[in-house]
Structure formats: C-alpha cells, structure tokens
C-alpha cells in the first residue's frame, strides 16, 4: 500500500515537473512573441536600419521629443526635396510650435549658420492659404513673412530664425522630419 | 525587388467618390513610404499624396481636404480615397513605392470624372 502511494506521489511530482517546464517554455515563447510584437511596431515606424541600431534615431538625424530631423547637405527644389524626405521614409519638416521653431534654428545655427531650408508649407494657388503638407493650418504665429511675389507656386523655408516665402522651383537645403522611435522601456 | 498592383479606378461623376488601392509584394522590408502620382504639366508626374512607414503624410494642395492617403500594414496596401471628385482629377494614378536606393512604380489605373 505503502509503495503504491509513493508511486502515485512519484508520478504526481513528474507530472508537476512537465507542467513546469511547459509553463516555462510557454513564458519563454510569449516573452518572444511581446519583443517580436515591439520590434514589428518599431520597424514600421522607422526603417531597419534604425530599428537594429535601437537608437530612436538613425545616424545623422537629429532628436527633439518624439521627432527626428535630418539636415540636408544638397540643395534641391521643393519637390524634390519631399521625394527625398520620402525615400529616408520622412517628409518634409512641420513646425508645430514656437518651441520646435526655436529648437530647429537654434541647430541650424549650430550646424551650418544661415542658409535657406525647405519645409513642408505651401500656399494654394487658389484660396492664398498657407497649409502644411498634411493638410493642417499653421498656427498664427508660424505664417511665413509675405516675401515672395512670384506668379509661380510659393513655399515655406526656414531662414536663420525666420519662416519666409519663395517660388518652389528656387534651390535650397531642406530639412526632414520622422516620428522617433518609441523606446520599448 | 519590389511589385506594385493598383486597382480601384474607374469612371465616376463629379462630386463623386473612388477608393483606390495599391498592392506591394517582393521585398517590402526595404520600403519606406508609398505614394500616389498623376502626370501633371508636360508629362511629368506630380506626387499627390503620399505616406511613410511611421504614417506621416503629404499632399499636393490641389488635393487637400478631399483626398485621404492611408495603409493597411498587414495587407502591405495602400490607399487613396478620392472624395468630391473634379473633371481635373481625370489622369492615370500611378502607385510608387519609395526605398532609399530605388523607386517602383505600378502601371497605373485610370481615373476619369465626367461633368
């Protein structure tokens, strides 16, 4: 009688070890799948190369808050310069506050001093307004100064610490902007 | 190498809607935006909207506020809703995938609004 309950209790704490060790495996495969989930999230926001480097920005780019930014070192019309920003996987920098104002000339003033960048503003043709490239409005106090007279289509560029007005077709530098990457922390 | 498949064209009266979608299939790892592009002035395609991989998005001003550029990751697609549609949105829309070292076009699905 007596051996036969040690062979059940026997049976009962291997069956006790499988179940473990199953419960192991599963936490170990979910941990997997979690960090598998985060690394899919990030590599859709941002390209691999970023993804694999962890920083929240790629190399050259520069961080403020949740935003990247890379200077251009080529000059290119304002077209062009959103293909650009598109092909790095970002578009052409949207100034949303006085804040972000003061944050990107300060680092151009930094970087190279005083030349013209291009940013995502253009003014329609039709209505005169002035709109970012998603469609949003610029807040009052990011209009660009009216200094540009052209017939042709007019867009938005960040001079020293100014926003100004120029035909889209002119040459400048421009600067492009992409989410940062959320730390999995 | 990177394939895109556009569909959803169509003819359509104006004040009216389309949903067009571009498909990518091959390396879609190395994309990092799509976009859509219509011949503008002198054959040249103009981008008319267009989105990153982090959802970032851009349009041209003609567009603005009756187009919405959107993606469904899963199904690696892309798609432009086209509301109050105008005669001079009449073009072919060319869906372009944008990597850092090459762009891929689909062969473009046509759009015609009649007055």
């Known amino acids: 009688k007596l051996l036969q309950v040690s062979t059940i209790a026997m049976q009962q704490q291997e069956k006790l070890i499988q179940q473990e060790r199953a419960l192991l495996n599963f936490t170990e495969w979910k941990r997997s799948c979690a960090l598998q989930m985060k690394y899919c999230q990030a590599f859709m926001q941002n390209s691999l190369s970023s993804a694999h480097n962890s920083s929240p920005c790629p190399n050259n780019w520069i961080q403020n808050r949740e935003s990247c930014y890379y200077v251009s070192e080529i000059w290119s019309i304002w077209h062009t310069s959103q293909e650009n920003c598109l092909k790095e996987g970002s578009t052409l920098l949207q100034i949303e506050s006085k804040e972000e104002m003061d944050f990107i000339t300060g680092s151009l003033r930094k970087i190279k001093g005083s030349y013209d960048y291009w940013v995502g503003l253009s003014q329609d043709g039709h209505s005169g307004r002035w709109l970012w490239q998603d469609g949003s409005s610029p807040s009052p106090g990011l209009l660009p100064a009216e200094r540009s007279q052209s017939a042709n289509q007019v867009c938005g560029y960040v001079k020293s610490n100014s926003l100004l007005s120029s035909n889209c077709s002119t040459w400048k530098y421009f600067i492009c902007e992409k989410y940062a990457l959320r730390s999995s922390v | 190498q990177v394939q895109l498949q556009e569909s959803g064209g169509g003819l359509v009266q104006a004040g009216g809607s389309l949903r067009l979608s571009c498909a990518a299939t091959?390396?879609?790892?190395?994309?990092?935006?799509m976009g859509w592009h219509r011949p503008a002035r002198g054959n040249e395609r103009e981008l008319v909207a267009a989105?990153?991989?982090?959802?970032?998005?851009t349009y041209v001003d003609s567009v603005k506020g009756r187009f919405t550029i959107s993606r469904d990751n899963a199904k690696n697609t892309v798609y432009l809703q086209m509301n109050s549609l105008k005669p001079e949105d009449t073009a072919v829309y060319f869906c372009?995938?944008?990597?850092?070292?090459?762009?891929?076009w689909g062969q473009g699905t046509q759009v015609t609004v009649s007055s």
């Open positions: 372009k995938a944008y990597t850092r070292d090459e762009d891929y």
């Open positions: 091959g390396d879609i790892s190395s994309i990092n935006a």
């Open positions: 989105i990153t991989n982090g959802g970032r998005t």
